[in-house]
């Protein structure tokens, strides 16, 4: 149930936005799939986790991710909203103590083991541009979204609001 305005309008605000409370306002477990219904899976290899985008076999169980939602305040001079200019930020954890991180230098999405408080690289601004689809924008790099590239998750720069409907940054959440 998640749309987006021109990215540029709010990009500066992301750097300055503060998460209003250290505990999430809600959490749920969901499986993550691409717009084209490929599953996001996580595999332990050589003591580190790898993230894959793949077609699952018919009865293969989907991996679940814990999504934790945090309220984050736009600076009032950016949004003009005062108290009501709230964004939702999420962290994504497929297994205990591991969170998805944005590696902006490598343009990659990685799983890192870390303790709370989580670093900014683990927070993503939630958008939805289509019914039932969500997108994840890096808190640390506004205008850059988690996307699919060559059957892996990668960071993808979205340079204008016209490109925000590009299918490779759209994801579906489901309970099954």
């Amino acid at each position: 149930a998640f749309g987006i305005s021109g990215v540029q309008k709010y990009t500066r605000a992301l750097h300055d936005s503060s998460i209003t409370g250290i505990s999430p306002i809600t959490e749920y477990l969901a499986s993550l799939s691409t717009y084209n219904d490929q599953s996001i899976t996580f595999a332990l290899e050589d003591e580190s986790y790898e993230i894959y985008v793949e077609d699952l076999k018919k009865d293969e169980k989907k991996d679940k991710v814990l999504l934790s939602y945090y309220e984050s305040q736009h600076p009032s001079n950016e949004s003009g909203d005062g108290v009501d200019g709230k964004m939702l930020m999420v962290t994504l954890s497929p297994t205990k103590d591991f969170w998805l991180h944005a590696n902006n230098k490598e343009h990659s999405v990685e799983l890192h083991k870390c303790e709370k408080p989580l670093p900014d690289q683990a927070f993503f601004v939630l958008h939805n541009m289509h019914s039932n689809c969500v997108s994840f924008e890096c808190k640390t790099d506004p205008g850059v979204f988690i996307g699919v590239k060559d059957n892996h998750l990668a960071l993808i720069k979205v340079d204008s609001s016209e490109n925000l409907c590009t299918e490779n940054i759209l994801f579906k959440l489901s309970e099954t």
């Epitope: 149930a1 998640f2 749309g3 987006i4 305005s5 021109g6 309008k9 709010y10 306002i25 809600t26 749920y28 969901a30 939602y69 309220e71 736009h74 949004s79 003009g80 909203d81 005062g82 009501d84 200019g85 709230k86 964004m87 939702l88 601004v125 939630l126 958008h127 939805n128 541009m129 289509h130 019914s131 039932n132 609001s161 925000l164 409907c165 959440l173 489901s174 309970e175 099954t176």
Partner: antibody, heavy 120, light 110 residues
């Protein structure tokens, strides 16, 4: 102050058209999902449709074809164009705004509503 | 088409009573459900979002629970100002829906 004010309601004959406006103040309308909701006299709330910040629009199944949602960012105003109106479209029409930017979410800000009466 | 089924359609209760209203989604909406209170001649007012999060300024006697397809709004001790109509809404799917709102529950004085 964050506020929504609807206008444009009134009496219209069956088969006629009407355009409702919803003027937003205190926030940028284009950053939020904006929704139209209606309520027939003595009935429940009925979701009409939504315009996303990226201009995607979704309508209730019954509203497709007759109702059109649009917005003018320069005027910070939301619109609902209603065509081929019927007696059963008689209702108070509300515009509403989601609680969060970018995300379709709960409706935290509502207008006062504008009454549309379809009658000959 | 996607639907929200709310029950009961009306309930008679006294001040101090515990009132429970339920809402069922025709398919899973995770926890994307909100609850509204509406009084005659007024616009709806947000009470609960994300199924259980209390909206700003809403008294703690209101609470919400549920996930997936089944959701509940509870008023722990009904106050005179709580006599109103309550609606659930799914905030998940905007595609192919008849109505995002439930049919409403009128809470009346016994």
């Amino acid at each position: 102050e964050v506020q929504l004010v609807e206008s444009g309601g009134g009496l219209v004959q069956p088969g006629g058209s009407l355009r409702l406006s919803c003027a937003a103040s205190g926030f940028s309308l284009s950053s939020y999902h904006m929704i139209w909701v209606r309520q027939a006299p003595g009935k429940g709330l009925e979701w009409v449709g939504v315009i996303y910040p990226n201009s995607n629009i979704y309508y209730a199944t019954w509203a497709k074809g007759r109702f059109t949602i649009s917005r003018d960012n320069s005027k910070n105003t939301l619109y609902l164009q209603m065509n081929s109106l019927r007696a059963e479209d008689t209702a108070v029409y509300y515009c509403a705004r989601t609680i969060y930017v970018h995300v379709y979410s709960a409706l935290s800000i509502w207008g006062q509503g504008t009454l549309v009466t379809v009658s000959s | 088409a996607f639907q929200m089924t709310q029950s009961p359609s009306s309930v008679s209760a006294s001040v101090g009573d515990r009132v429970t209203i339920t809402c069922q989604a025709s398919e899973s909406v995770l926890n994307e459900v909100s609850w509204y209170q509406q009084k005659p001649g007024k616009a709806p007012k947000l009470l609960i979002y994300f199924a259980s999060k209390l909206a700003s300024g809403v008294p703690s006697r209101f609470s919400g629970s549920g996930s997936g397809t089944d959701f509940t709004l509870t008023i722990s001790s009904l106050q005179p100002e709580d006599f109103a109509t309550y609606y659930c809404q799914q905030d998940w799917s905007m595609d192919n829906i008849d109505n995002a709102f439930g049919g409403g529950t009128k809470v009346e004085i016994k």
